[in-house]
């Protein structure tokens, strides 16, 4: 059986939309499937790599690599999206290309970044972990770390940094899929909202779905002990 909830929820574009949340009900009137997984049920994607889930994550990453920061022209906010999802008239799509990007490193201004921009994250303004020396962030936003400390400045003069961010990574469903959403939408969908991250590639949704002890490598499920838990 299914339990359907419908509600008006604030979405990425800053408008309220009617959203459906469909929950598979437990046949035995017990905990939900997500709760059962958290409690240690024999759920194979938490025990070993699942090809379907792996392909889903790779597909999400490929899309994200090509994303940019969509900044609303009315200063109502910004969100990481694909160019096609960013209004040409009501917003500005900030995407580095050709030689418009910032330098890869302060010691070589000539080599420009082409991957980005990312809403609220920039290698020039991140103090921790700083992109410098032997630890220059790659020219691939899906390999960027989470920035834990920004340079102290109210305004940077960069469109993608001075806007009010409207969406962050949200882990939805038992498949460990990730979407950049508003907090409201994420909570309504019973997802896990990552306040600290800017990109889906920075979070490991399956690790969150599985719970219990974190994977040794967040990319590789290793909870073999589930076989004895349930």
């Amino acid at each position: 059986a299914q339990h359907v909830t419908t509600q008006l929820v604030l979405r990425n574009k800053g408008v309220y939309e009617s959203v459906k949340y469909i929950q598979q009900e437990n046949f035995w009137i017990g905990p939900s499937s997500i709760d059962l997984i958290h409690l240690g049920a024999k759920f194979s994607p938490c025990i070993r790599k699942d090809q379907q889930i792996e392909q889903l994550v790779l597909r999400e990453r490929d899309l994200e690599r090509d994303s940019g920061c969509c900044v609303q022209n009315d200063h109502s906010g910004c969100i990481q999206t694909q160019r096609k999802d960013c209004s040409e008239t009501l917003a500005t799509f900030v995407k580095w290309q050709d030689d418009t990007g910032p330098p890869m490193d302060k010691s070589d201004l000539g080599q420009k970044r082409t991957s980005g921009a990312v809403c609220h994250q920039d290698p020039r303004t991140c103090e921790e972990p700083a992109s410098s020396g032997a630890h220059i962030w790659p020219d691939d936003i899906t390999k960027w770390p989470i920035c834990t400390e920004q340079a102290k400045s109210n305004r940077t003069g960069f469109l993608h940094m001075d806007c009010q961010i409207k969406g962050r990574p949200c882990c939805i469903s038992t498949k460990g899929s990730c979407e950049i959403t508003t907090r409201e939408y994420c909570e309504f969908m019973h997802g896990y909202f990552h306040e600290e991250a800017t990109l889906c590639s920075q979070v490991h949704c399956l690790d969150k779905v599985c719970g219990l002890l974190p994977f040794l490598n967040p990319e590789v499920p290793d909870q073999f002990y589930r076989l004895w838990l349930s």
Epitope: D98, D99, T100, K106, S107, D108, L109, G110, K112, R124, T125, E127, A130, S132, G133, A151, T156, G157
Partner: antibody, heavy 120, light 107 residues
Framework: QVTLKESGPGILQPSQTLSLTCSFS??????????IGWVRQPSGKGLEWLAH???????YNNPVLKSRLTISKDTSKNQVFLRIANVDTPDTATYYC????????????WGQGTSVTVSS | DIVLTQSPATLSVTPGHSVSLSCRAS??????LHWYQKKSHESPRLLIK???QSISGIPSRFSGSGSGTDFTLSINSVETEDFGMYFC?????????FGAGTKLELK
């Protein structure tokens, strides 16, 4: 308030080493993205970027003068130093120290400049 | 090194008139172009960053435009305090380079 002040010998002879000091206040060279650079302007000519040093100790010297330039800092004293070895008459110029940022690569504050004459 | 060519070398203007100063780069520098003003016996002062971004404390009569290799600094209704030298600077690559300057003088 950010201030930078250059000091130097004023006059020196060819083949000598020019030693310049930039004393600054209102900010720290330990702050992320902060840098101090040296720019010179020979009389009636354009500005020339010489060298700079970053908050993390990384340095840059203009390749045209590279072998003659040495830049260093003393963060505890809020000072940056520039040495130009084996000077000659074309090194006669006004030398400025300038604050730069690795976020923008613009000079947001300049010193008043110090005049240096190389003459025998 | 990237060469910046400024024109004209000297511009004579009457207060109240508007002027345009040109800066041309020897190669494309995208939007990595900034403008400075230098008055006699004073240090240079940043006017415009990244082609057209305003700097706090700089009067709104100063504006910038252009991209790639051709850039313009415009002064709408020149005031007596605006006379002096104007330099452009590129930050596309090391070493940072400057134009030779345009001297704005009283006509």
């Amino acid at each position: 308030q950010v201030t930078l002040k250059e000091s130097g010998p004023g006059i020196l002879q060819p083949s000598q080493t020019l030693s310049l000091t930039c004393s600054f206040s209102g900010f720290s060279l330990t702050t992320f993205a902060m840098g101090i650079g040296w720019v010179r302007q020979p009389s009636g000519k354009g500005l020339e970027w010489l060298a700079h040093i970053w908050w993390d100790g990384e340095k840059y010297n203009n390749p045209v003068l590279k072998s003659r330039l040495t830049i260093s800092k003393d963060t505890s004293k809020n000072q940056v130093f520039l040495r130009i070895a084996n000077v000659d008459t074309p090194d006669t110029a006004t030398y400025y120290c300038a604050r730069i940022s690795s976020i923008y690569y613009i000079i947001d504050n300049w010193g008043q400049g110090t005049s240096v004459t190389v003459s025998s | 090194d990237i060469v910046l060519t400024q024109s004209p070398a000297t511009l004579s203007v009457t207060p109240g008139h508007s002027v345009s100063l040109s800066c041309r780069a020897s190669q494309s520098i995208s939007n990595n172009l900034h403008w400075y003003q230098k008055k006699s016996h004073e240090s240079p002062r940043l006017l415009i960053k990244y082609v057209s971004q305003s700097i706090s404390g700089i009067p709104s009569r100063f504006s910038g435009s252009g991209s790639g290799t051709d850039f313009t600094l415009s002064i709408n209704s020149v005031e007596t305090e605006d006379f002096g030298m104007y330099f452009c600077q590129q930050s596309y690559n090391w070493p940072l380079t400057f134009g030779a300057g345009t001297k704005l003088e009283l006509k």
